[in-house]
Structures are given as structure tokens and as C-alpha cells.
Amino acid sequence: VVSHFNDCPDSHTQFCFHGTCRFLVQEDKPACVCHSGYVGARCEHADLLA
């Protein structure tokens, strides 16, 4: 069974600047789960509200 998201391919190991890359199966694209204190599509911005 393939889950809704899983590990990104190796080509995207550096895709997320301050977060973890997850492959969105339904949308067929990589996405980022940001570490605490970071925001942005690729977790590239420090969250000034954190």
C-alpha cells in the first residue's frame, strides 16, 4: 500500500532548506515539512512569529 506521502527521491535530498522532504503521492511532487521556527514552500524563511 502506497501512503499519501513518503520519502522523497534521492535527487531531492537538499530540496528543503530547514525541513524534511516528503513526496506527495496524490499530487506527484515533493513538499517540505518545516522544522520548528521555519516557514515557506521550501522552509527557507525563519518564522518571525515563532
Epitope: 502506497v2 513518503n6 527521491p9 534521492d10 535527487s11 537538499q14 532548506f17 521550501r42 527557507e44
Partner: antibody
């Protein structure tokens, strides 16, 4: 997402050429930009990709010393420069973005001729 | 590098019939996450390539369901049922698993 590529180029052997690919309705910093080569009546070759957010690049080995990819995030534009051009570089060059290449530019024809 | 092989340079087909286009990879495209990173494109004459199938068997947005993809880790098939005149062009497979990404040499669909 739309990718608009620069116009056709006629260049001399030994010269360089710089092609552009400008994105609309999409921030190029949000994903990698890829470049492909297609020689006349031939197949597609992946040249490489650039991460516009930090300038990091990956090249196919055969293009490592031939191609240079750059990006300007202020103009939302990616560039491909080819150096020391020969007749083998006569081709259409495409930019494409997003995983799986759902979005392609219209291509730029580069003709190398004396 | 992963080598993608499309053995048939061209396939002739009569409109309304079905056709299958094959592609092989020199290495399995099945990632440990369970996804198979094999993609199919159609390049119509004078146009840019268009994504048809993603991850081996998923239909891209806006693509008619006459197109379908199947396969294993190294052998893949694109099937077109009820071929129409607008399906003419060159079909390419692409491995999107690892750098350098590589395309098959293409298979030209020709109407008889």
C-alpha cells in the same frame, strides 16, 4: 505556470550563447529548473538542473564542461549558457520545471553555422 | 547512468485500433518509498513535449483516458486505445529516479 524562452539564435562556431527562460505565475525559487537538448530529428537529452534559490546545479556528465546554468530570482528567469559552440550544439533547447516536467517552455532553436 | 531503451523507432497504427509502446530501463525505477519513477511524454510535430503519464501508471491532468501506463521495475508499456489522428507524434519515456535523468530514444506513432 508559463515558461517563456528567448528567441532563435544563429551563432558562429567557437562562440558562446546565453538562452533565457522566464516564468510567469510561478516563483522559480520554489522548484528546480531543468534544461533539455533536442538535436534536429533526434531525441531528448537532460542537460541539468539549477536550484534558483541558491544556485546549486547538477549537470549530466556530457554537458559538465559545455553548459552553465544560472538564475536571477529578481526577474524570475533561468539562463543556460553554452560555450565553444560546434555544429553538434545545433539544437532546440527547452526549459522545464516542477517534478515530472509538467511545464515546458516553447524551446529555443540554436543554429551553429559559419 | 540509467539507460532507457525504446526498441521500436516507430509503430504504424490504424485509427480506432489500439497500440502499445514499450520502454526498458537498465536499472529498476522502483524507489524504496514504493513509487516507480517512470514518466511518459508525447511530442507532437513542432511542439514541446507534453506529460502523459506520471509514476508509471498515473494519468496526467487533461490527458484522455484512452492512454494508460503499466509495467514493472524495469519494463514499461504505454497503451493507447482507440487511436486518433491527434495522437501522432513521438513518445518518450523518462526515468525520474536519479541524476542524470535520462530519456528513451523515442517511438514515433504513425497513422497507416
Amino acid at each position: 505556470v508559463q515558461l517563456q524562452q528567448s528567441g532563435a539564435e544563429l551563432v558562429r562556431p567557437g562562440a558562446s550563447v546565453k538562452l533565457s527562460c522566464t516564468a510567469s505565475d510561478f516563483n522559480i525559487k520554489d522548484d528546480y529548473m531543468h534544461w533539455m537538448k533536442q538535436r534536429p530529428e533526434q531525441g531528448l537529452e537532460w542537460i541539468g538542473r539549477i536550484d534558483p534559490a541558491n544556485g546549486n546545479t547538477k549537470y549530466a556528465p556530457k554537458f559538465q564542461d559545455k553548459a552553465t546554468m544560472t538564475a536571477d530570482t529578481s526577474s524570475n528567469t533561468a539562463y543556460l549558457q553554452f560555450s565553444s559552440l560546434t555544429s553538434e550544439d545545433t539544437a532546440v533547447y527547452y526549459c522545464a520545471t516542477s517534478w515530472g516536467f509538467p511545464y515546458w517552455g516553447q524551446g529555443t532553436l540554436v543554429t551553429v553555422s559559419a | 547512468d540509467i539507460v532507457m531503451t525504446q526498441a521500436a523507432p516507430s509503430v504504424p497504427v490504424t485509427p480506432g485500433e489500439s497500440v502499445s509502446i514499450s520502454c526498458r530501463s537498465s536499472k529498476s525505477l522502483l524507489h524504496r518509498n514504493g513509487n516507480t519513477y517512470l514518466y511518459w511524454f508525447l511530442q507532437r510535430p513542432g511542439q514541446s513535449p507534453q506529460l502523459l503519464i506520471y509514476r508509471m501508471s498515473n494519468l496526467a491532468s487533461g490527458v484522455p483516458d484512452r492512454f494508460s501506463g503499466s509495467g514493472s521495475g524495469t519494463a514499461f508499456t504505454l497503451r493507447i486505445s482507440r487511436v486518433e489522428a491527434e495522437d501522432v507524434g513521438v513518445y518518450y519515456c523518462l526515468q525520474h529516479l536519479e541524476y542524470p535523468y535520462t530519456f528513451g530514444s523515442g517511438t514515433k506513432l504513425e497513422i497507416k
